[in-house]
């Protein structure tokens, strides 16, 4: 048929549409980490699983060494959820005994990181100071917002403390990404 | 017209280009739940509102018996809010008494259920303790992530006790659910 | 070509199909805001970044005075946000003290303004209880979901005290909305 | 060399509590997780749970609500209590250390074990 | 809980045999898998991690395959020593252990 031959360029020629089951897409699940010692101001880069259980990665986005490669340029939205959990921090005795008043926190970056700019960029950031008394504490911290990305971008996600991220579940601490 | 009538031929044979307004889509929000005893490992369904207000069901995304029942397979981004209120969790009191370390919790959990599969996945949990001193308290939970779903997969909202959700207003507590 | 001529009209006879590429979308990032009076139930509006950074608008999504304005019909994912922070709390010590039991909080609304219309409508309310022991916090409200918005259409973000608002990061504190 | 040496009572009655601690010499205690395991007489191994060297515990479920574990950084040591124990808890009780390592994929194996503990449980 | 089935349970063989022992995971762990041998009043000793890599000092007699959700263990040539129990354990999620085999001196 003429008209079939026709389409393709058709297609193409008038506008970049595209079946929306073929755009890069992924959802990565939380995995045991390396229980690493904790340093103030470098925060670790988690590794995840792509392909296990509820993880994917689809459409030419691939899962490496602890980044998501952007396949294609465009709009994307990401996101990343955290279960954090740690012991009792006794911040409201350190306060007493007159230390300085900066409590503990916990803190999830979504970072950005492009091969030609030299430095990473930090795309979301979650922070949340932890001041619980009278018992161990668990709790998750959320982010997810759209940014355009260009092709060969690499994303991760970056912690303040590995050894406080709860590996147990799945459903638990995650991170995805999808072009738009 | 000869055009029209080649259209959607034309369209299935070269990919599966769709409109996006023909997409299934949700957005339910929260009503008045029924009472249920609160089980420890039991975590009870949220029923939802589908057509008044903010909420709404559209293109064969239909909501049945505190189910979001899936039209057809693809991924879709799912997310849920749950606003929880609270008295006073005196958990510090309760560690200082010698009794164990198990702080209070809430919990939200977003539960696929195929039917040919025996057992629920849950896809999403947000939990964190609750160990407020000096007052009420409320706050809430959120999750969205994007899963790969089966035509009649059914979606649903757990929660750890649902006699704490803040059924009150429809922007509190929500559950929603979009094919990409 | 003759077959150019046709293919816009063959595009909008069949299927409202279009680019994703040509969606309006738009990104919004924190900046400094001017401190107002806080009164107890008025929730101020805040401004943004609309262009620097991370922040872009596109597609005919534009943003003035505050308000992100919807240039088309449709169903769009509205997310937001808002990381605060403050100084200690003492609710313990207020109850102690016997006063009313109402705990300070922080609140973020996503409000929905339609100028035939005369009352805004809320969309998404993220709203916690502020009850820290010990010293200054801070922590973020996240919101998102999916809601039909007409042309002409006006979203903001109010917040319970916007001198409480962290304005110092483009990843701490931002909005965001996508046509879906 | 690391090695790891256990300790704890051997006879206990039934209600009353199981604690044993393992010392690591040797080696280092941040980086690993540290793990106790059990394995009734004749039967096969069952994870009880492990810990890290902040004290961040991950517990097997079916025996959460009875396990505690604890860590002693100073001392280099981690400890197991497995409250109202019954004949069912008769076992040998190992520690281990478990690590995390990577090819093209993250995997996990405990490499360096404890040389056990029989406890018995009876009246 | 990922459930893990070791076969057999029991094997009898001679030296110099070639053995292979089988372990089924419930659901893909793609290559979460370690083997363990243990002689009896002894602790467990690590052979192979990651499905096939060789835990260092461990003979190269010892291999390990497979993938997804079937694994194997193989000794290329049974030797005195290696009369013993042997458990796969895999990694992916809670820790669980096959049930055990049993290798015999025929």
């Known amino acids: 048929l003429k008209g079939q031959e026709f389409a393709p360029s058709h297609q193409q020629v008038y506008a970049p549409l595209r079946a929306d089951g073929d755009k890069p897409r992924a959802h990565l699940t939380v995995v045991r980490q390396t229980p690493t010692q904790h340093f103030k101001n470098q925060f670790p880069a988690l590794h995840w699983e792509h392909e296990l259980g509820l993880a994917f990665t689809k459409n030419r986005m691939n899962y490496t060494n602890k980044f998501l490669l952007i396949p294609e340029s465009g709009d994307y939205f990401i996101y990343s959820q955290v279960t954090f959990r740690g012991m009792t921090s006794e911040c409201s005795e350190i306060r007493q005994a007159g230390r300085p008043n900066k409590p503990d926190s916990i803190t999830v970056v979504i970072t950005k990181v492009t091969d030609s700019y030299p430095e990473p960029t930090q795309l979301l950031m979650g922070t949340k100071s932890v001041c619980e008394v009278g018992s161990n504490w668990f709790q998750p911290i959320y982010l997810g917002a759209m940014f355009s990305l260009q092709e060969g971008d690499k994303l991760m996600v970056n912690v303040s403390d590995i050894s406080l991220v709860d590996y147990t579940k799945e459903d638990k601490t995650f991170f995805g990404a999808f072009l738009l | 017209l000869k055009g029209q009538e080649f259209a959607p031929s034309h369209q299935q044979v070269y990919a599966p280009l769709r409109a996006d307004g023909d997409k299934p889509r949700a957005h339910l929000t929260v009503v008045r739940q029924t009472p249920t005893q609160h089980f420890k490992n039991q975590f009870p369904a949220l029923h939802w509102e589908h057509e008044l207000g903010l909420a709404f069901t559209k293109n064969r995304m239909n909501y049945t018996n505190k189910f979001l029942l899936i039209p057809e397979s693809g991924d879709y981004f799912i997310y849920s809010q749950v606003t929880f209120r609270g008295m006073t969790s005196e958990c510090s009191e309760i560690r200082q008494a010698g009794r164990p370390n198990k702080p209070d919790s809430i919990t939200v959990v977003i539960t696929k259920v195929t039917d040919s599969y025996p057992e629920p996945t849950q896809l999403l949990m947000g939990t964190k303790s609750v160990c407020e001193v000096g007052s009420n308290w409320f706050q809430p939970i959120y999750l969205g992530a994007m899963f790969s779903l089966q035509e009649g997969d059914k979606l649903m909202v757990n929660v750890s006790d649902i006699s704490l959700v803040d059924y009150t207003k429809e922007d509190k507590t929500f559950f929603g659910a979009f094919l990409l | 070509l003759k077959g150019q001529e046709f293919a816009p009209s063959h595009q909008q006879v069949y299927a409202p199909l279009r680019a994703d590429g040509d969606k309006p979308r738009a990104h919004l990032t924190v900046v400094r805001q001017t401190p107002t009076q806080h009164f107890k139930n008025q929730f101020p509006a805040l401004h943004w970044e609309h262009e620097l950074g991370l922040a872009f608008t596109k597609n005919r999504m534009n943003y003035t005075n505050k308000f992100l304005l919807i240039p088309e019909s449709g169903d769009y994912f509205i997310y937001s946000q808002v990381t605060f922070r403050g100084m200690t709390s003492e609710c313990s010590e207020i109850r102690q003290a016997g006063r009313p039991n109402k705990p300070d909080s922080i609140t973020v609304v996503i409000t929905k303004v339609t100028d035939s219309y005369p009352e805004p409508t809320q969309l998404l309310m993220g709203t916690k209880s502020v009850c820290e022991v010990g010293s200054n916090w801070f922590q973020p409200i996240y919101l998102g979901a999916m809601f039909s918005l007409q042309e002409g259409d006006k979203l903001m973000v109010n917040v319970s005290d916007i001198s409480l608002v962290d304005y110092t990061k483009e990843d701490k504190t931002f909005f965001g909305a996508f046509l879906l | 060399q690391v090695q790891l040496q256990q300790w704890g009572a051997g006879l206990l009655k039934p209600s009353e509590t199981l604690s044993l601690t393992c010392a690591v010499y040797g080696g280092s205690f941040s980086g690993y997780y540290w793990s106790w395991i059990r394995q009734p007489p004749g039967k096969g191994l069952e994870w009880i749970g492990e810990i890290t060297h902040s004290g961040i515990t991950n517990y097997n479920p079916s025996l959460e609500s009875r396990v505690t574990m604890s860590v002693d950084t100073s001392k280099n040591q981690f400890s197991l209590k497995l409250s109202s124990v019954t004949a069912a808890d008769t076992a040998v009780y190992y520690c281990?250390?478990?690590?995390?390592?990577?090819?093209?994929?993250?995997?996990?194996?405990?490499?360096?074990w404890g040389k056990g503990t029989l406890v018995t449980v009876s009246s | 809980d990922i459930q893990m089935t070791q076969s057999p349970s029991s094997l009898s063989a001679s030296v110099g045999d070639r053995v292979t022992i089988t372990c089924r995971a419930s659901q893909s762990i793609r290559r979460y898998l370690n083997w363990y041998q243990q002689k009896p009043g002894k602790a467990p000793k690590l052979l192979i991690y990651a499905a096939s890599s060789l835990q260092s000092g461990v003979p190269s007699r010892f291999s390990g395959s497979g993938s997804g959700t079937d694994f194997t263990l193989t000794i290329s040539s049974l030797q005195p020593e290696d009369f013993a129990s042997y458990f796969c354990q895999q990694s992916y999620r809670t820790i669980t252990f096959g049930q055990g085999t049993k290798l015999e001196i025929k």
């Open positions: 281990a250390r478990g690590q995390v390592g990577t090819t093209d994929y993250y995997y996990f194996y405990m490499d360096v």
